[in-house]
């Protein structure tokens, strides 16, 4: 037991926010400014992320956690950890190589990001269109014509919209 303990890495005692300083006999030194270590036992501290240009700081860097960025107004994050910002469009539009363009007839986008998606085809589920679609909203499907006899059940709500995918552009 004693032998095992003496072989233990002295750096394992260094907590988050410090690093094991080889230049100072492996003592635990605080991370320098603008750097952090999020776990114990680190031999170096990582440089903090800096949010510049289209990025703005959402969370400041601390000695134990990295900074987090988001995007300036009019843009939204893409990529892991917001490594890229993409221009917002209005609802009813999608971002193309030439900028924001209105959704074509028969498609909609209810968000400021993502692509225009086709209206739901109610007839595929044997239902009828209760509310017409627009550039900003999907159609609302109602009961099938056969269900519209007296005493039929009430209108089914539309399925929740899926988060649109993003093409790498």
């Amino acid at each position: 037991f004693e032998r095992t303990r003496s072989l233990q890495d002295p750096c394992s005692n260094c907590p988050a926010g410090t690093f094991c300083d080889n230049n100072r006999n492996q003592i635990c030194s605080p991370c320098p400014p603008n750097s952090f270590s999020s776990a114990g036992g680190q031999r170096t501290c990582d440089i903090c992320r800096q949010c510049k240009g289209v990025f703005r700081t959402r969370k400041e860097c601390s000695s134990t956690s990295n900074a987090e960025c988001d995007c300036t107004p009019g843009f939204h994050c893409l990529g892991a950890g917001c490594s890229m910002c993409e221009q917002d469009c209005k609802q009813g539009q999608e971002l193309t190589k030439k900028g924001c363009k209105d959704c074509c007839f028969g498609t909609f986008n209810d968000q400021k990001r993502g692509i225009c998606r086709p209206w739901t085809n109610c007839s595929l589920d044997g239902k009828s269109v209760l509310v017409n679609g627009t550039k900003e909203r999907d159609v609302v499907c109602g009961p099938s014509p056969a269900d519209l006899s007296p005493g039929a059940s009430s209108v089914t709500p539309p399925a929740p919209a899926r988060e649109p995918g993003h093409s790498p552009q």
Epitope: K52, V54, G79, S83
Partner: antibody, heavy 118, light 107 residues
């Protein structure tokens, strides 16, 4: 069409300064930042600094004491000045537009070839 | 400073082949990585940002991948015009730093 055109001297004597003008067209300096990057002969790329759309600057610490980047939005010009040149500052110097989506360079100038020699 | 290491200085490939250029960061940079192509005698050209997002107009033969410390630029169906040097760049923190470059030679 987005363009960055550079003008500046090809030969500078040691201890003198380098001034390069980057004239941009097809975009506004009030919207985009402009970076400066250099490439010594046969070597890789080295970032020197940037002037952002709001006029703020960030410099590589290795050059901060002898580098100045300014701009004139009305003439669409960015001005690069580096003092105290030595032989190892011989390089191609590029201005480059900052991408609107990240901190990377989506359009580059043609480069200014600088030789520092007496 | 964050060091970006491109260990392969030269790579040789043939037209129609698939080739992967690698880049390693000295610390975790998430996906804050861009790739550039520099043809002989020309200025660099942006290919990829955010590790995997192609710039507008870049052929879809070019794909970027990776996160953390290991990044790859893959060129499928290599063309003769791909003869160039390829650089990675991190924008996690200042100073912005580049890899030393990988020269692609076409056999």
């Amino acid at each position: 069409q987005v363009q960055l055109k550079q003008s500046g001297p090809g030969l500078v004597q040691p201890s003198q300064s380098l001034s390069i003008t980057c004239t941009v067209s097809g975009f506004s300096l009030t919207t985009y930042g402009v970076h400066w990057v250099r490439q010594p002969p046969g070597k890789g790329l080295e970032w020197l600094g940037v002037i952002w759309s709001d006029g703020n600057t960030d410099y590589n610490d290795a050059f901060i004491s002898r580098l100045s980047i300014t701009k004139d939005n009305s003439t669409s010009q960015v001005f690069f000045k580096m003092n105290g040149l030595q032989a190892d500052d011989t390089a191609i110097y590029y201005c480059a537009r900052n991408s609107i989506t990240s901190v990377s360079f989506d359009c580059w100038g043609q480069g200014t070839t600088l030789t520092v020699s007496s | 400073d964050i060091v970006m290491t491109q260990s392969q200085k030269f790579m040789s490939t043939s037209v129609g082949d698939r080739v992967s250029v690698t880049c390693k960061a000295s610390q975790n940079v998430g996906t804050t990585v861009a790739w550039y192509q520099q043809r002989p005698g020309q200025s660099p050209k942006a290919l990829i940002c955010s590790a995997s997002y192609r710039y507008s107009g870049v052929p879809d033969r070019f794909t970027g991948s990776g996160s953390g410390t290991d990044f790859t630029l893959t060129i499928s169906n290599v063309q003769s015009e791909d003869l160039a040097e390829y650089f990675c760049q991190q924008y996690n923190s200042y100073p912005l730093t580049f890899g030393s470059g990988t020269k692609l030679e076409i056999k």
